[in-house]
Amino acid sequence: AGVFELQIHSFGPGPGPGAPRSPCSARLPCRLFFRVCLKPGLSEEAAESPCALGAALSARGPVYTEQPGAPAPDLPLPDGLLQVPFRDAWPGTFSFIIETWREELGDQIGGPAWSLLARVAGRRRLAAGGPWARDIQRAGAWELRFSYRARCEPPAVGTACTRLCRPRSAPSRCGPGLRPCAPLEDECEAPLVCRAGCSPEHGFCEQPGECRCLEGWTGPLCTVPVSTSSCLSPRGPSSATTGCLVPGPGPCDGNPCANGGSCSETPRSFECTCPRGFYGLRCEVSGVTCADGPCFNGGLCVGGADPDSAYICHCPPGFQGSNCEKRVDRCSLQPCRNGGLCLDLGHALRCRCRAGFAGPRCEHDLDDCAGRACANGGTCVEGGGAHRCSCALGFGGRDCRERADPCAARPCAHGGRCYAHFSGLVCACAPGYMGARCEFPVHPDGASALPAAPPGLRPGDPQRYL
């Protein structure tokens, strides 16, 4: 067990052009506070995924009012450290998210308003018990300077807080086979309870005689580094020398999650999804309160009035869940009618309508021909939800308002020439062809494949297509 400590040194405009406007003004005085979220390992995780190592919220900083015309200075900060207690071994590698929040103190209806000013994230290696590590992170035009460290809570010591120390029983020396506890020379290492030979750096135990490995290590004594390259089976070949995970019980076998938590395997370990009221790597920590910073994504924590809800998270727009851990999909409101497809664009909901329906929610059934006039003698044809006009000869377009070029489709066959005519088109056929569209060949003996031509028309004369 131990505590991760975060000290914010400054939050203000970063170097370079484009200094941000002060977040506070004379009309809207405000104060800052910070939230830190820790996750084990170096995985790239979404900001809203659970803070499995823990989270903490700072106190509110002093009230700040911008001086008119002055650039945004470093803003006044809350006092004290942000402390995230961890109950299990310190994982050595971790991801962090640090959020800077602004609390507006103007005449807000319903109390103060919160808004996220900046969010920085990173992945680091850190040994417990080491010195403060300094860091600078930039988010847009803002710059955050901070230090952090992990320290073990007595009696735990070591880089992972897995070795135990006890006060010396004798003033001069430790008991047989027990070393002094550096750096606490006046204390002695507690009697070993882990399996003999269990790596003090990479292994730990919670029960006498066991040896459990920190992330990245494997083998019965946690002395073999995990390699992801040469593993053949889902959990790797059985040779301990290859550095692959040994096949056998999966990480979720026997369900390591306490208090009704459900276990799911991750590439290197397992993850517990805890029921309400429990948290920690194995859902072993109960009695969550607002002091534990249980609300994600800027949710405001309010102490619950009864044991059923030790706290309640008031979520900012766009987030939901008992810990504001889930993004609201407003399409869950089922807003689109008539089989429309819903799209949540963040700033708005959109419905993509099926053919034959329209309106922001696809609520309008395009009652095909109702109230639709087809011009120039066209007739409306219903079908498929989209009205269509069947246009009279010489007209086209959606409503038959456009004059059609009857020759555009090259209607005259066999090289016949097309002429537009007030009542349609006329084909002048090439020698040897006849018919309204020059579609019929004239027989070599002069007889046509057609019945005798109408009076006054010889084969080869232009035929008017009526």
Epitope: P317, V328, R330, S332, L333, Q334, P335, C336, R337, C351, P360, R361, E363
Partner: antibody
């Protein structure tokens, strides 16, 4: 015609549990989300949240997280509101209402819940 | 959360009057404003949705208007059956919120 018919009035003691039903008819139940609204005696309307009738996923307004649970029996076109560990301040009329994409277009007649020791 | 304010909590009018009930949102709600009628027996009905669209079966004497943050419901020719409490509700941003209601009585 479209109807939402709710179960009858309930008289409960503090700490008990109540489950209210809302039976829908006249439309395809799973096409529309179902919402719940609370009205305390002499007060206005307060939106409690909704349940997606296609997936069964509930969504709660902040003041109704914890002791409140929305559920469905799709085969019976029925939505339910359950309130656990009842308190005096839960005394109210609870309405179910269908959402059509713009508004809650059809409402149940309301179910009165009285919590008294 | 968006606050909805109905400044008039009760209103007296005579039969045949033109009555207007107003509602103000604490921020722009992009016309996603609905009006509901609650009769003395407790039943609730939708009257107007999306600021000005009349719900099916609602008499044409009811109309709605507005934009941005200010909206109103008008009853052009008050009838006895219109005696009720009227609530506005914004559907633009979760959580949805209602106005406090305006109780309409006959003089």
């Amino acid at each position: 015609q479209i109807q939402l018919v709710q179960s009858g009035p309930e008289l409960k003691k503090p700490g008990e549990t109540v489950k209210i039903s809302c039976k829908a008819s006249g439309y395809t139940f799973t096409d529309y989300s179902m919402h719940w609204v609370k009205q305390a005696p002499g007060k206005g309307l307060k939106w409690m949240g909704w349940i997606n009738t296609e997936t069964g996923e509930p969504h709660y307004a902040d003041d109704f997280k914890g002791r409140f649970a929305f559920s469905l029996e799709t085969s019976a076109s029925t939505a339910y509101l359950q309130i656990n560990n009842l308190k005096n301040e839960d005394t109210a009329t609870y309405f179910c209402a269908r959402y059509d994409g713009y508004a809650m277009d059809y409402w149940g007649q309301g179910t009165s819940v009285t919590v008294s020791s | 959360d968006i606050q909805m304010t109905q400044t008039t909590s009760s209103l007296s009018a005579s039969l045949g009057d033109r009555v207007t009930i107003s509602c103000r949102a604490s921020q722009d709600i992009s016309n996603y404003l609905n009006w509901y009628q609650q009769k003395p027996d407790g039943t609730v009905k939708l009257l107007i949705y999306y600021t000005s669209r009349l719900h099916s079966g609602v008499p044409s004497r009811f109309s709605g208007s507005g934009s941005g943050t200010d909206y109103s419901l008008t009853i052009s020719n008050l009838e006895l059956e219109d005696i009720a409490t009227y609530f506005c509700q914004q559907g633009d941003m979760l959580p949805w919120t209602f106005g406090g209601g305006t109780k309409l009585e006959i003089k």
